[in-house]
């Protein structure tokens, strides 16, 4: 899978990074950058909607490890964490969108680094031509919601969202080209992942250029 | 029932040590938890001081720095403190305590047994 | 380090009366407060922790709330073994620390 980097990422002003993280790939968060040898305890909250909060926690004195309420075994420490503090998400579900917070004991009070994680999915994007001079362009089940948008503009109808259990929706826009003497329209899907750029040509097939899904990360 | 008692000089000379011991019954102190010092001023104000734990391993509080040490005697089931270069201001009733079981190893930093305190004065 | 300041600093009341006595935080602790009595001679009692969870042993008539910096010890329908000195302590990070104490007083 593909690794996640962390240039992706925005830090608030409290210090929580918002981090948004391709569905399949392999998350690596980090605690901050305290010496180890003034830790006395590192603890990782992970808060996921739905379900009770889980820690991972870790006692440096009595090099001892306890877990609450943690069950999903795709989050791990990267390693034992006198080694390495870091929490893996391997690989990333959908389920995984939440709030990671590393915490770190040490004699001089507790430091933070708290994680939002949007997990992202890459919407599968299909653009047709359903009557005449009438053209539909769907984006299948992304996260979040893709953006589309015509080159040239038509006369759309309203963009609708269809919301699924999983947090993924489609997003569907169909335009007509009445009036228009375009011969050729081009769908435009923007979304976190990667935009794609689709066309057709009206009362004719369907051709596709632009940027394929996961360019931008 | 966990029992903690104090005992040590009640009278210290500025400059000098002060050694205070905490003899714990109904328990034993490498099967489990924090001990720990702490001390009420005169006026009412507490501290805490430090910690070993069952392994025997130690934290202080970094204000106090290296004038603090916390050892422990595992034949007797005792733990110490001992303060160095004491002055006027360190005058108060010291106190050992445990601390309550941990369930996640942070945020469970409370005292659930303590002994009753013994006072100490620092005056030449 | 985490200042801890607690009020009133003495309190005078019937048995049988309510009380409160509040403890404010410099920062955000969350619910990690813990309250304490203590009482001359006799080894000082944990009875609540986490903000509001009562220790064992301790009776119902004690109840803690509060959340973030503000933080109330309430006794309800005090008995005459309530009296003495009520301390909070913050366990949410090293170093702890303790309020200034509060001294309950038969009125």
């Known amino acids: 899978g593909k690794q996640m980097t962390q240039n992706y990422s925005k830090m608030s002003a409290e210090g929580n990074i918002s981090q948004p993280v391709l569905m399949d790939t392999n998350a690596n968060l980090c605690c901050p950058p305290i010496e180890f040898r003034n830790l006395i305890v590192i603890v990782w909250e992970i808060i996921i909607r739905g379900q009770p909060s889980c820690t991972k926690a870790y006692r440096k004195e009595t090099n001892e490890t306890k877990e609450t309420n943690c069950t999903d075994k795709r989050i791990t420490w990267v390693s034992t964490p006198d080694q390495n503090s870091d929490l893996q998400i391997h690989p990333v579900a959908i389920t995984h969108d939440g709030y990671y917070r590393c915490i770190m004991a040490t004699p001089d009070g507790n430091f933070h680094r708290g994680y939002h994680l949007q997990v992202l999915v890459t919407p599968e994007v299909t653009l047709f031509q359903s009557r005449n001079r009438t053209a539909v362009c769907k984006a299948v089940a992304g996260k979040p919601a893709a953006q589309i948008s015509w080159i040239p503009a038509g006369d759309c109808a309203p963009t609708e969202h269809e919301y699924w259990g999983n947090g993924t929706v489609t997003v569907e826009s169909m335009c007509h080209w009445g009036d228009h003497n375009a011969s050729t329209v081009t769908c435009h899907v923007s979304h976190l992942t990667g935009n794609k750029s689709l066309y057709i040509k009206l009362n004719s097939g369907l051709r596709t250029s632009g940027s394929p899904a996961l360019d931008l990360l | 029932e966990i029992q903690l008692q104090e005992s040590g000089p009640g009278l210290v000379k500025p400059s000098q040590s002060l050694s205070l011991t905490c003899s714990v019954t109904?328990?034993?102190?490498?099967?489990?938890?924090?001990w720990s010092w702490i001390r009420k001023f005169p006026g009412n104000k507490m501290e805490w001081m430090g910690y070993i734990n069952y392994g025997g391993s130690t934290n202080y509080k970094p204000s106090l720095g290296s004038r603090i040490s916390i050892t422990r005697d595992t034949s007797k089931n005792q733990f110490f403190l001992q303060l160095n270069s004491v002055s006027p201001e360190d005058t108060a009733t010291y106190y050992c305590?445990?601390?309550?079981?941990?369930?996640?190893?942070?945020?469970?930093?409370?005292?659930?047994?303590w002994g009753p305190g013994t006072m100490v004065t620092v005056s030449s | 380090e985490v200042q801890m300041t607690q009020s009133p600093s003495t309190l005078t009341a019937s048995p049988g009366e309510s009380v409160s006595i509040n403890c404010k935080a410099s920062?955000?602790?969350?619910?990690?407060l813990a309250w304490y009595q203590q009482k001359p001679g006799k080894p000082n009692k944990l009875l609540i922790y986490s903000g509001s969870t009562l220790h064992s042993g301790t009776p119902s008539r004690f109840s803690g709330s509060g959340f973030g910096t503000d933080f109330t010890l309430t006794i309800r329908n005090l008995e005459p073994e309530d009296f003495g000195l009520y301390y909070c302590?913050?366990?949410?990070?090293?170093?702890?620390?303790f309020g200034s104490g509060t001294k309950l007083e038969i009125k």
């Open positions: 920062k955000n602790i969350r619910s990690y």
């Open positions: 109904g328990y034993t102190i490498t099967s489990g938890y924090d």
């Open positions: 302590q913050q366990h949410h990070e090293y170093p702890l620390t």
């Open positions: 305590a445990k601390y309550n079981e941990y369930k996640s190893y942070i945020y469970d930093w409370y005292f659930d047994f």
